[in-house]
């Protein structure tokens, strides 16, 4: 057991197995469930994280249960197919050969079909609206302080460039964080807004994905900001294709 092995961890993803067996004895970490090598300097893609989550034995999960106020989107949990870069494949199917198309954050954007269903391209989610309700406080948070704190959080914890935090809206007790990132704006090395939103979602549920780090401790001018519910809305560059039957 060497010092190199002690250092060989993945700070940004605890759902990994790491060992110093990379090129030249360098540390290499692989995502659970897929075995894909991950870049531990940044966020792991949501697809690989969902795959790791589904592969973990139900009784051996190290993740904390969400508190009583957290809403769990059970529809959103499935064992996804990821491409070699860790992105969602445009078409997802379950074990019973039911298939559907997803966007870049893995959310279904068509009716379900069979194996003949075609999904021509992975449609990018370019606008994410995170809708939060905070627990009651003695007085409302100062809007500009709240704005600065959330921008700081997304930069420092989730590595997202501030230019992708389009706006922070606040009407006590509702906070809305708007993330925007077009295909043309996203450079190599930029964190994807979908991945940042997923890490944030898991953080506010008390299920941090970071290695050995304390949970999310959000404070605005020293006052704790405790989230009691989260809703996330996704807007794609191409509108989804659902039949009228689903809309009624």
């Amino acid at each position: 057991h060497t010092a190199a092995q002690d250092n060989c961890t993945c700070p940004t993803n605890k759902m990994t197995v790491c060992s110093p067996d990379g090129p030249g004895g360098r540390c290499q970490c692989r995502a659970l469930g897929s075995g894909v090598a991950v870049d531990c300097s940044t966020l792991t893609s949501k697809c690989l994280l969902l795959k790791a989550r589904m592969s973990a034995p139900k009784n051996a999960r190290t993740l904390v249960r969400p508190n009583e106020h957290a809403l769990v989107d059970n529809d959103g949990l499935y064992d996804p197919d990821c491409d070699p870069e860790g992105r969602f494949k445009a078409r997802q199917c379950n074990q019973t050969s039911v298939c559907w198309c997803v966007n870049s954050v893995g959310v279904r954007r068509t009716d379900k079909g069979d194996l003949s269903l075609r999904c021509d391209e992975l449609v990018r989610t370019h606008h994410i609206l995170i809708d939060l309700r905070h627990r009651p406080t003695a007085s409302a948070f100062n809007h500009s302080d709240l704005d600065a704190e959330l921008r700081r959080l997304f930069r420092e914890r989730y590595r997202l460039h501030p230019k992708f935090v389009a706006a922070v809206h606040y009407e006590q007790p509702t906070i809305q964080i708007e993330l925007r990132q077009n295909t043309s704006q996203k450079a190599a090395g930029d964190v994807d807004i979908g991945d940042a939103a997923y890490y944030f979602e898991r953080d506010v549920k008390g299920e941090s994905l970071f290695q050995g780090r304390g949970g999310l401790d959000l404070r605005v001018r020293g006052e704790p900001l405790q989230v009691e519910r989260t809703l996330i809305y996704y807007l794609d560059e191409i509108p989804p294709k659902f039949s009228m039957k689903r809309l009624t």
Partner: antibody, heavy 122, light 109 residues
Framework: QQLEESGGGLVKPEGSLTLTCKGS????????WMWWVRQAPGKGLEWIA?????????TYYASWAKGRFTISSTSSTAVTLQATSLTAADTATYFC???????????????WGPGTLVTVSS | FEMTQTPSSVSEPVGGTVTIKCQAS??????LGWYQQKPGQPPKLLIY???TLASGVPSRFKGSGSGTEFTLTISDLEPADAATYYC????????????FGGGTEVVVK
């Protein structure tokens, strides 16, 4: 714990060179960033590029360095910087430095090498 | 993005106080470091996180500020404090711009 740069010297204009940074007393296979920073004679400091030496090998480059400089880490004990199409403006002392955190956007340099002088002249 | 450091040079007597300012063109929270560099030597980290003293650095060095305005104050100046001081951030490294300030030469009379 220390860092040492090597590979500096006299290079002709339009020439190339490879600088190497080796660490002793610690392993590069950790969760931090290694940086190259340079300083022209009598001038200030400017960063060239960092590389993550944990799992992943992420890199960033200063705008002016893209295309001419390449940072890499092929082993757990060394980081290299390759430079091409050198001009007199690249004459400088080249330092390697270790970033103190695994987050590149919150990095400070808590360990520096003594530097190696690169002179570009015909 | 730009880091502007002032003044470029300052001269104070032994026992005096020097104040160096660094201004970021965008909010960088408290992600700022201060370095001391003497001729022929690499820089030495003095302060990180805008106000936290690095190991072994005397308490005469004090960092303050957050957001866009930062200050390094050196009190009870000693001859050994004669050096060039730099501020630095990596907050906007993905924009490819230099995160170092231009430097301040401190002369101790």
């Amino acid at each position: 714990q220390q860092l040492e740069e090597s590979g500096g010297g006299l290079v002709k204009p339009e020439g190339s060179l490879t600088l190497t940074c080796k660490g002793s007393g610690f392993d590069f296979s950790g969760t931090y960033w290694m940086w190259w920073v340079r300083q022209a004679p009598g001038k200030g400091l400017e960063w060239i590029a960092p590389i993550y030496v944990g799992s992943g090998s992420s890199t960033y480059y200063a705008s002016w360095a893209k295309g001419r400089f390449t940072i890499s880490s092929t082993s757990s004990t060394a980081v290299t910087l390759q430079a091409t199409s050198l001009t007199a403006a690249d004459t400088a002392t080249y330092f390697c430095a270790r970033g103190a955190t695994n987050n590149v956007f919150m990095n400070y340099f808590n360990l520096w090498g003594p530097g190696t002088l690169v002179t570009v002249s015909s | 993005f730009e880091m502007t450091q002032t003044p470029s040079s300052v001269s104070e007597p032994v026992g005096g106080t020097v104040t160096i300012k660094c201004q970021a063109s965008e909010d960088i929270s408290s992600n700022l470091g201060w370095y001391q560099q003497k001729p022929g030597q690499p820089p030495k980290l003095l302060i990180y996180g805008a106000s936290t003293l690095a190991s072994g650095v005397p308490s005469r060095f004090k960092g303050s500020g957050s957001g866009t305005e930062f200050t390094l104050t050196i009190s009870d100046l000693e001859p050994a404090d004669a050096a060039t001081y730099y501020c630095q951030t990596s907050y906007y490294i993905d924009d490819g711009v230099n995160g170092f300030g231009g430097g301040t030469e401190v002369v101790v009379k």
